[in-house]
């Protein structure tokens, strides 16, 4: 949905959320291009790209929340994700540098689509909260009330370490979106009925 416009159709909105989370759990859209661009696409280096425990809520945690709490948690987490993606983007090579080093410009374009995609998802989360008459949700363009600040990566001059931290974050993000998709797939066909 375009920012600020909300569908009144529950099943269409849920379908959009399901579609967005389906696409955002796909590592070929974010993690894989990041690994290639950052020169981590070597078996020994890939082994170091593991999800940091506790960086994202677990599927079990998400399943334990009601619809309202789930949407609030998702909204807050997506706020943190936006901060981290902005940070990652600042450290990406420029298009001309990519071409010189023979890397794929499409990978950079995929990475640059990540934030608009998250904003689109966040808008639909806000719309769903409105549809479920959830007055506690804040506008999608603002930080959520009580939203924890994004975890600040440990200051380090080690460029390689920063690349690995970005890689771990993205792996966790894809896993989180997979969990979110599984929760949405269990939502019922009407806004006032949940099958958990």
């Amino acid at each position: 949905a375009a920012m600020g416009s909300c569908s009144k159709e529950y099943r269409m909105l849920l379908g959009q959320l399901q579609k967005q989370t389906d696409l955002m759990q796909d590592t070929s859209r974010l993690l894989d291009p990041y690994i290639r661009i950052q020169g981590l696409d070597i078996p020994k280096l890939r082994e170091h790209c593991r999800e940091s425990p506790g960086a994202f809520p677990s599927e079990e945690t998400l399943r334990g929340l009601g619809r309202r709490g789930f949407l609030q948690t998702l909204n807050a987490t997506l706020g943190r994700v936006l901060h981290r993606l902005a940070d990652l983007e600042q450290h990406l090579p420029k298009a001309q540098d990519l071409e010189r080093s023979g890397l794929n410009i499409e990978d950079l374009e995929k990475l640059q689509m990540a934030r608009p995609n998250v904003l689109g998802l966040r808008n639909n989360v806000y719309c769903m909260a409105q549809l479920l008459d959830n007055s506690d949700m804040t506008e999608p363009t603002k930080a959520g009330r009580g939203t924890p600040q994004p975890p600040t990566p440990t200051p380090t001059s080690d460029v390689f370490q920063r690349k690995l931290e970005g890689c771990s974050f993205l792996r966790g993000y894809h896993r989180f979106m997979h969990s979110v998709g599984r929760v949405f797939s269990k939502w019922g066909e009407s806004p006032n009925r949940s099958r958990r």
Epitope: S7, R11, Q16, K19, F184
Partner: antibody, heavy 120, light 106 residues
Framework: QVQLVESGGGVVQPGRSLRLSCAAS????????VHWVRQAPGKGLEWVAV???????DYNAAFMSRFTISKDNSKNTLYLQMNSLRAEDTAVYYC??????????????WGRGTLVTVSS | EIVLTQSPATLSLSPGERATLSCSGS?????MYWYQQKPGQAPRLLIE???NLASGIPARFSGSGSGTDYTLTISNLEPEDFAVYYC?????????FGQGTKLEIK
């Protein structure tokens, strides 16, 4: 393999009713949403209605008062009851399947269609 | 409802050429879907989620775009590609189709 076969079309007078059927095979209607989409002769495609795996329905507002979508899970068959038919309802009516169990409003498998002609 | 406008209405090309079909929405949409329809046949899904090839679709087909403007490209036309192509959205209710672009042999 996954297949949809429509039937029930034909020539009908304005104001009369008709019921279309769509027999599904290779998948269960309890797992997927299935839609009706129509195409007037020489024209484009127009979404009519959907029935989701749990039985909930959604309609194009243009047809909501006259058309009813339903299904019989035991027969794995979809229906479209069309009342108060008009000449402008003349079209090929296709049933089409959503690609997975989510609420996806696009279509990965289509039937061959059944022609409805409304004429006096 | 969102109105999708396809251009051109008819495109005349020869086999081996590149076809570029456009679809413009009256409002922004999240994803676009493309179908191919041959005379007397049902439509067939070609592209889902703007740029993903549907199952069994050859790689000469590709999709791109965002917001209100989307494109279907057929890179190296084969004789069997001459047909009518429709775009479709479901970002806004109800789902709607474009009026179609007829791709004919020059």
């Amino acid at each position: 393999q996954v297949q949809l076969v429509e039937s029930g079309g034909g020539v009908v007078q304005p104001g009369r009713s008709l019921r279309l059927s769509c027999a599904a095979s290779g998948f269960s209607l309890t797992n997927y949403g299935v839609h009706w989409v129509r195409q007037a002769p020489g024209k484009g495609l127009e979404w009519v209605a959907v029935i989701w795996r749990g039985g909930s329905t959604d309609y194009n507002a243009a047809f909501m008062s006259r058309f009813t979508i339903s299904k019989d899970n035991s027969k794995n068959t979809l229906y479209l009851q069309m009342n108060s038919l008009r000449a402008e309802d003349t079209a090929v009516y296709y049933c089409a399947k959503s690609p997975n169990s989510n609420f996806y409003w696009y279509f990965d498998v289509w039937g061959r269609g059944t022609l409805v002609t409304v004429s006096s | 409802e969102i109105v999708l406008t396809q251009s051109p209405a008819t495109l005349s090309l020869s086999p081996g050429e590149r076809a570029t079909l456009s679809c413009s929405g009256s409002s922004s949409v999240s994803y676009m879907y493309w179908y191919q329809q041959k005379p007397g046949q049902a439509p067939r899904l070609l592209i889902e989620d703007t740029s993903n090839l549907a199952s069994g679709i050859p790689a000469r087909f590709s999709g791109s775009g965002s917001g209100t403007d989307y494109t279907l490209t057929i890179s190296n036309l084969e004789p069997e590609d001459f047909a009518v192509y429709y775009c479709q959205q479901w970002s806004s209710y109800p789902p709607t189709f474009g009026q179609g672009t007829k791709l004919e042999i020059k």
